[in-house]
Structures are given as C-alpha cells and as structure tokens.
Amino acid sequence: EEELQVIQPDKSVLVAAGETATLRCTATSLIPVGPIQWFRGAGPGRELIYNQKEGHFPRVTTVSDLTKRNNMDFSIRIGNITPADAGTYYCVKFRKGSPDDVEFKSGAGTELSVRAKPSAPVVSGPAARATPQHTVSFTCESHGFSPRDITLKWFKNGNELSDFQTNVDPVGESVSYSIHSTAKVVLTREDVHSQVICEVAHVTLQGDPLRGTANLSETIRVPPTLEVTQQPVRAENQVNVTCQVRKFYPQRLQLTWLENGNVSRTETASTVTENKDGTYNWMSWLLVNVSAHRDDVKLTCQVEHDGQPAVSKSHDLKVSAHPKEQGSNTAAENTGSNERNIY
C-alpha cells in the first residue's frame, strides 16, 4: 500500500475578522495509527492549535467525527478570527509510539490571511489657527486593516485634493497595517464653512468607503477689516463715531476706544451678525462730547481679535470747526499688523 500522504488542499484561506476559518486536511491512508495535530508555524517555536488526543481548544472544532475508526478528514474550524490568527497552519500526522507519539508526516501548510476593516479615519488639523492665503497641513490616520492594499483620497468641499503624501506601515508583511496621510490645504476667506474630508477605501468595505472630516472653522482665522465713520450730530455739542468691524472669524474679539491715546471704553463683541460665509460683523459706537475738548481729537478704534496683536483705525475730529461741517477723515494708523495672525 502507498505511504500515507497528508493533503492540505488550500494554499490560502482568506477570512474576515470575526468569522470562522475552515482549514482542510485529509489523510490518504489509515496507517500508521496515530493522532493528528495542528500547528501554526513550523520548527521548534511552532504553536499547537489542536491536538486530537488531548487538551482543551475552545475556539477549535473538527469538521468530521475524529473518533470514527475510518475517518481520514482532519479539517478544523477556528472561530472568531482576528488579525492575530494570521499565519501558516500545518496539519501533522503522528505515529503512535511509546512513551511519546512520533511525528510522521506534515501537510504542505495553509496560509490563513485575515481581512480586517480599517478603523474610522481620524483627521486632525494644525495646532494653531492660520489666516487666508496660508497653507495648512491636515493628517489622516486609520489602523488595523488587512490586506495591505488601501486607497486614500482627500477632498475639500467635494473637490479632490492632489497635494498629499501617504504612507502604509509596516512596509513588509504584517498581520495588520496602518495608513497615515498628510494633505496641504490653502485657506481662503470663504473657508469658515468648508470641510476637509479623508476617504479610505478597502476591500473589506464593499465599495462603501470610510470618511473622516475636519471643519476648517477650527483652523481658520479671518482677521477683521475696520472702518471708522462719523455719524450725523445728535446734539449741538455731541458727535457719534462708529467703528464697523467686518468679516472676522472666530467671534472672540475685544474693542477699545481711545481718545487722543487714552482708553475711553473697552467692550467685548457680543451681539454680532453672521454673514453667509460664516464670518461675523459687529459695530461699536462712541458718543463724543465736543465741548469737553479744546483741541482736535484723535479717536482710535483698536481691535484685538482672537488673541492676535491689535489692529486699529483712527479718525480725526476737528474741534475748531462746527460739528455739523465735520468731514469723515479715515486716515489709518496701524498699531498692529493685519498680516501677522497667530495665537
């Protein structure tokens, strides 16, 4: 009679995480008598997965009844598969011996590969806010997927971005993989309502990609524009001056009025109006008693926005002229920079 062969008919078994893997193995003969054992890996460090003779293997069940005398099917099922179960499994026939059974013949092995879904992509933006025209970086990370093949795309408001770099780690074989991508985005003044989306497609997702989002409202700072104007006179000796603070984001803003360089009043933006693009407008006014001044008055509206250096705009109020004839000179004096906007 021909010598016993151990046949593992599958080179590979591909299973989704959480499912059951069937590892097939048959013997071509009942002789020699002795048990079958399953191992993961080969050599001295191999891990025992199932022993027909003894032991407790709660995740393993046999496909057929191994107690039947003429059984030659030694296939097993392993339940609740995780990526950690990936590896090469060997079905090994032992010959009955004394005191110990002796390894007789091994199958060629079956490689178990586990399909695991990527985690939901997490998108994170820069630590500090940035102003329009600046380029900021966003990162996207997803972990725990297998196999390694994965596709990552970036979008801003539905438009695909092209300026990004992606790495999948590790480079070599592993039970599971991670992806890390960095995208560069140029901010515009209209980006308060914008979203950056990272989209991950993987074979386990059956054509339904995972998405992670970041709102540019958490990244952008739109500095305000200031306009100081003189309103018609309320009374013979009073002038109403307004400071229009336009198109700013976020809302955090403090305004200080100065008369000839001296602080007159400080207030925090509260009842703001929101523009369609998500930026805010606010107006502050100052009632100036002209009769209290002998000389011309320099009125300055100074705004500190979102912790940035103050920006200001001034208005010269000429006391010598009749208030009703006063023009609206809006010569500006910058005590801070409109361009430098950092925390």
Epitope: Q8, K11, T110, P147
Partner: antibody, heavy 118, light 108 residues
Framework: DVQLVESGGGVVRPGESLRLSCAAS????????MSWVRQGPGEGLEWVAG????????WYADSVKGRFTISRDNSKNTLYLRLFSLRTEDTAIYYC???????????WGLGTLVTVSS | EIVLTQSPGTLSLSPGETATLSCRAS??????LAWYQQKPGQAPRLLIY???SRATGIPDRFSGSGSGTDFTLTISSLQSEDFAVYYC??????????FGGGTKVEIK
C-alpha cells in the same frame, strides 16, 4: 480588466539562471494565490509552482523542486519565478496564471519564452 | 500524483457537429476538475470549473459533466472558433496540480 504580463524570458545555457516576472493589474493581487504553468514546444501544459496570498506557502512540481523558487511582492503586484540550474528540458513558454478560490486558473498571461540551449 | 488521461488524442469533426471529450483521473478527484481551451499562439482560457460550472463569458454550447474519476466536456453545434486543443486539470487535492495531455479538435 484583469491583466497578467510576463517578462524575463530569453536564451540561456544549461546550468545558468533566469528570473521571470509577472506584472498583475486590474484586480486585488493580494487576494489571489498565483501559479506558473509552462508549455514545452509542441507539448501540453505542465504546472510548475504556486504561491499563497502572502507567500507563506509554496508548492512545486517534482520536476523543478530545489531548482525553481516562486515568490511575490504584493506591494508591487508582481509574481516572480527564479530558475536555477536550468536544463534543456526546461525550454518552454512560461505562463503566469491567477488562481481562483480552489486552485484552478481563471486568468492567464500571454507567456514568456525560455530557451535553454548549449 | 494524480494522472489525467484525455481521449481521444484528436477529434475530427465538421462545424455544427457535437464534440465529446473525455478525461479520466487515476484517483477520485470528486468534482475538482476544470477544462481549458487553447488556440495556436494563445494562452489557455478557462471554460469549465467544478466539473460542470461554466466560466464567465463562456457560451452555453460548452457543458461539463462527471465526478469522481470520469469527466466529459461536450461542445454542441461546433463553431469555427471552437477548433482548438482542450485540456482538463484536477485541483483540490494539494500539490501537484496536474493537466491531461490534451485533445485536439480539428476540422474534418
């Protein structure tokens, strides 16, 4: 569209070596076992070697065992066959073939010709 | 090693006729048998797998039958493009995978 394109064939002397490549596209390469099948001039098909999804399990025909090595690089979607100690009887068209779930071949490349001649 | 024997070696038929090709295995291969078609200068093409399942895009004039050790490929109403060499292959029994020697279907 599934495509398998073999390269690396040529004329060599007995005892010399060669490396064949198969560039795969149009499918998830790392989801399929792969094989090499050869066909000598005027002869039938002969399976040469097969490899598992991640390369952990390799099978060889007795006629090439110890002389040929099959491997794959999933990051490059490429299958390889290294041919050592070549003999005149290894002269054949070598086809790269994609295996379906139960080791039959559902897609084939056009082949690359290996000629071993002194 | 499982040996597959194909017969006849050559089959001479006219277009419109039915071709019956045989493949016999030296051991029980259950239903693990595939059929391929190869035309001169071309790579083989999968026709039938699991003894009787038609591969994608294969016309229904090709049919497979059998299990265990005896298998048949039938081509009804032969078309001009069907004249080629046909191979059977067994699988599902570990290495080595083996092919039959082939049957040439030629125009009479």
């Amino acid at each position: 569209d599934v495509q398998l394109v073999e390269s690396g064939g040529g004329v060599v002397r007995p005892g010399e070596s060669l490396r064949l490549s198969c560039a795969a596209s149009g499918f998830a390469f790392s989801d399929h076992d792969m094989s090499w099948v050869r066909q000598g001039p005027g002869e039938g098909l002969e399976w040469v070697a097969g490899i598992s999804l991640r390369g952990g399990v390799t099978w060889y025909a007795d006629s090439v065992k110890g002389r040929f090595t099959i491997s794959r690089d999933n990051s490059k979607n490429t299958l390889y066959l290294r041919l050592f100690s070549l003999r005149t009887e290894d002269t054949a068209i070598y086809y790269c073939a994609r295996e379906s779930w139960n080791t039959f071949f559902d897609y084939w490349g056009l082949g690359t010709l290996v000629t071993v001649s002194s | 090693e499982i040996v597959l024997t194909q017969s006849p070696g050559t089959l001479s038929l006219s277009p419109g006729e039915t071709a019956t090709l045989s493949c016999r295995a030296s051991q029980n291969v259950r239903s693990n048998l595939a059929w391929y078609q190869q035309k001169p200068g071309q790579a083989p093409r999968l026709l039938i797998y699991d003894a009787s399942s038609r591969a994608t895009g294969i016309p229904d004039r090709f049919s497979g039958s059998g299990s265990g050790t005896d298998f048949t490929l039938t081509i009804s109403s032969l078309q001009s493009e069907d004249f080629a060499v046909y191979y059977c292959q067994q699988y599902g029994n570990g290495p080595p995978l083996t092919f039959g020697g082939g049957t040439k279907v030629e125009i009479k």
